[in-house]
């Protein structure tokens, strides 16, 4: 082992306080007690140490907790966090949604990095699910957050965690992330009514299948373009121009800017002509009149 | 126990000069930064300047830049400041503190008075 | 005008709460710690918190500190007569190389 240079006189730190922030790096890792440093980890956050000197103070804590750092120290971290590697902080136990926020805050306003994905990731498998409390937080500090896991990883999500959604929070998901979102969205607000129920659906229904959408025609709930274009394609197709109709309702006037852009485009393949033209829009490229629709999936499970 | 001694304060004419002492004691003096603030009468407090242990950077009011001089000797565990072509402005209870990023001991202050 | 913004008066009788809010900016509160200091008539300042929420030893927990964003706050519970003093929040400022105070609290026990 390299010998160590010994602290000079008189500078043996007695409590971490402001003059350390002059020591040298050497003289920090001399004089400053590994020990002392992990009971006073609050006041570290509270003082202006440059990044180098926080290197040799994260140095002493490795030292000190070479099997991963205690909650005590790591609810305390502070600006400390940002120097930790996804290494390190593979070896913490974080149960307390106290110390998330907190680890949270320091990286507030940035984009989620490596060091913040390991240790939700760490938190979450410790809780065992993602629960509304840490939804909530996770979801306030990055709104993309939800859209940043598997499909598998939000199966672990329970209906009642689905209130904590905003519709931002999805708006990065994609079709396979919201065919797992949307039951328990659906189980979650089963008990609204109507109007309430749709309010709160509509951000999951990229994930619903064509039954669910036509039970909503039925509801005079005047979805949006915006949230029928996020539709799955497959989900739409059977429907009818009726059932399309009743959907949107004034909105259905927007369909014609939309024709030749999935699910419209696709839709419109699939209606007949006529049925199109009872809409009043100028919708083209349905099927012509006489014409006779094989429905080839049926064919299929027949033969 | 940490002491804080300030003196050299008085009456001087505006354009004039005075330098004040704070004589330390109860802590090691040369592993602190040390501070000036000042109280006009019946007014709050103003910072005037900061020195690191090792006098490496001093710090600066704008209020006071290039007329005041902060210094310190640790041999004789002494904090200066030398004021320089004074103003009425500058007239205040000079306190000398320990620490630049929170005063944890204040001396009693000199009080300086720029008058004609 | 001070960097720094308090009320320039707080009141409350013997045993209630007083707080006395300090504002600053992202350069000042908002990056540094805050400390809290009490001058009693005719007296130097004396540290009453520092680093947004520690108390040195002899200060009452009667007092105690906060920090959230750019401001924080002083509290004293139980109000007591020999509490009347000026109250001053401090923080050093990274944009102007230097420390700024509020203007100061004057807390009457009525």
């Known amino acids: 082992e390299v010998e160590k240079t010994a602290c000079p006189s008189g500078k043996k730190a007695r409590e971490i306080d402001e003059s350390l922030i002059f020591y040298k790096k050497w003289e920090l890792e001399a004089c400053v007690d590994a020990a002392l440093l992990a009971t006073q980890m609050d006041r570290v956050n509270a003082i202006p140490f440059t990044y180098e000197q926080l290197d040799v103070l994260k140095h002493k804590l490795d030292e000190l907790y070479p099997q991963g750092y205690p909650e005590s120290v790591i609810q305390h971290l502070g600006y400390l966090f940002l120097k930790m590697s996804p290494e390190d902080i593979r070896k913490w136990n974080v149960t307390s949604l106290e110390t998330l926020k907190a680890l949270l805050e320091v990286n507030k306003g940035h984009e989620m990095s490596p060091q913040v994905a390991t240790l939700i990731d760490r938190f979450v498998k410790g809780r065992g699910q993602l629960d509304k409390d840490t939804l909530d937080t996770l979801t306030a500090f990055y709104p993309g957050y939800l859209c940043s896991l598997s499909p598998e990883e939000l199966s672990s999500v329970p209906p009642s965690s689905i209130w904590a959604v905003r519709p931002q929070d999805l708006d990065t998901c994609d079709p396979r992330q919201l065919d797992v979102l949307y039951p328990k969205a659906r189980l979650a607000f089963q008990n609204m009514n109507g109007s309430e129920y749709f309010v709160k659906i509509q951000s999951f229904l990229g994930g619903a299948p064509t039954e669910d959408l036509k039970a909503l025609s039925q509801q005079n709930v005047s979805m949006d373009l915006a949230t029928f274009m996020k539709l799955r394609t497959d989900a739409v197709l059977p429907l009818t121009v009726a059932e399309v109709q009743k959907l949107l309702g004034p909105h259905v006037e927007g369909l014609k800017a939309e024709e030749r852009h999935r699910p419209v485009r696709d839709w419109i393949l699939r209606q007949r002509q006529d049925d199109l033209d009872t809409l009043g829009l100028g919708l083209q490229g349905g099927i012509p009149n006489g014409y006779l629709v094989l429905d080839l999936s049926m064919q299929e499970a027949l033969s | 126990e940490v002491q804080l001694l300030e003196s050299g304060g008085g009456l001087v004419q505006p354009g004039g000069s005075l330098r004040l002492s704070c004589a330390a004691s109860g802590f090691t003096f040369s592993n602190y930064a040390m501070s000036w603030v000042r109280q006009a009468p019946g007014k709050g407090l103003e910072w005037v300047s900061g020195?690191?242990?090792?006098?490496?950077?001093?710090y600066y009011a704008d209020s006071v830049r290039g007329r005041f001089t902060v210094s310190r000797d640790n041999s004789k565990n002494t904090l200066y400041l030398q004021m320089n072509s004074l103003r009425a402005e500058d007239t205040a209870v000079y306190y000398c503190?320990?620490?630049?990023?929170?005063?944890?001991?204040w001396g009693q202050g000199t009080l300086v008075t720029v008058s004609s | 005008q001070s960097v720094l913004t308090q009320p320039p008066s707080a009141s409350g009788t013997p045993g209630q709460r007083v707080t006395i809010s300090c504002t600053g900016s992202s350069s000042n509160i908002g990056s540094n710690a805050v400390s809290w200091y009490q001058q009693l008539p005719g007296t130097a300042p004396k540290l009453l918190i520092y680093?947004?929420?520690k108390r040195p030893s002899g200060v009452p927990d009667r007092f105690s500190g906060s920090k959230s964003g750019t401001s924080a706050s002083l509290a004293i519970s139980g109000l007591r007569s020999e509490d009347e003093a000026d109250y001053y929040c401090g923080s050093w400022d990274s944009s102007l190389n230097g420390y700024v105070f509020g203007g100061g609290t004057k807390v009457t026990v009525l």
């Open positions: 680093y947004n929420s």
């Open positions: 020195i690191p242990p090792d006098s490496g950077s001093k």
């Open positions: 503190a320990k620490n630049m990023f929170s005063f944890d001991y």
